[in-house]
Amino acid sequence: MAVTACQGLGFVVSLIGIAGIIAATCMDQWSTQDLYNNPVTAVFNYQGLWRSCVRESSGFTECRGYFTLLGLPAMLQAVRALMIVGIVLGAIGLLVSIFALKCIRIGSMEDSAKANMTLTSGIMFIVSGLCAIAGVSVFANMLVTNFWMSTANMYTGMGGMVQTVQTRYTFGAALFVGWVAGGLTLIGGVMMCIACRGLAPEETNYKAVSYHASGHSVAYKPGGFKASTGFGSNTKNKKIYDGGARTEDEVQSYPSKHDYV
């Protein structure tokens, strides 16, 4: 029950996280600039990974996409790539985890297969979350480093002068959405990996009859067949006459190369 809950919760948390990563990637407010000293009108400029927008105090808003790839900073391209990789991995992880859910029965799928699928999706969610966190952090770092240098950037153009405008640069809402979403996806992935341990049939007991013949004494024992440790055995060579059939959990047993069925 706890395993199912952990798996289900991991799936839901990851789902919310990936939805957040998609939302952050599509959002326009990755960085914002408030041109408070503009002599004409109050201008609020904000950028996303795909387009840049301007909003004026009059209410006028206009957005333009970055139609070229060549003129954009390499860091921005890297952030785009990280976010897309995160979304793709997350989407595949969600697809895999749906089939891995313990509460969903698909044909005669064994628990071992479900455990493997749960682990796979968990790892995908972890990598997806890390990609999103890395992408957002790279962008935030780009903003910080870029605008520390903006004051010194002044140069003369053809006849006129070009200089960078002193603006208040702030982290946009998308950065915070991305950080939180990446964290949730990461947590969801960890939960799926934890759930995988509970799903794996490490100690699954299958009731079987094992006969151990040692010398003239024969012991009958309705023991358990362990998938991982071989057949149960009565290694101490004791005769069991008490009539009470004991399971393998009650009698400490060790595998022996002389055991046979």
Epitope: V54, S58, G59, F60, P73, M161, V162, Q163, T164, V165
Partner: nanobody, 121 residues
Amino acid sequence: QVQLVESGGGLVQPGGSLRLSCAASGNIFRIDTMGWYRQAPGKQRELVAGISRGGTTTYAHSVKERFTISRDNAKNTMYLQMNSLKSEDTAGYYCNAQAWDPGTFRYLEVWGQGTLVTVSA
């Protein structure tokens, strides 16, 4: 890089009219605000008129009702229609633009080389 080129300046009699043009060229992504500044000899540069991308305008008190600023966003061009010119309007007129540059992820302020307007009888 973005360049601004002013044109339309010259000698005009008091009460006359002139139309200044400012054309932006180069690698332009989006120009948000544009403005006309003037600087008379021995004086500080002052804003004459400005216009935002959305069409919001601002004027210096001394030119209100006489000057009209307009803009063509598609052509990245700004105009200043100057009527009822006075001798105190004599100055070098400079075009200014604030443009967003995706290449540097920064706002750039660009200045033109200026055009001279002389109001004299």
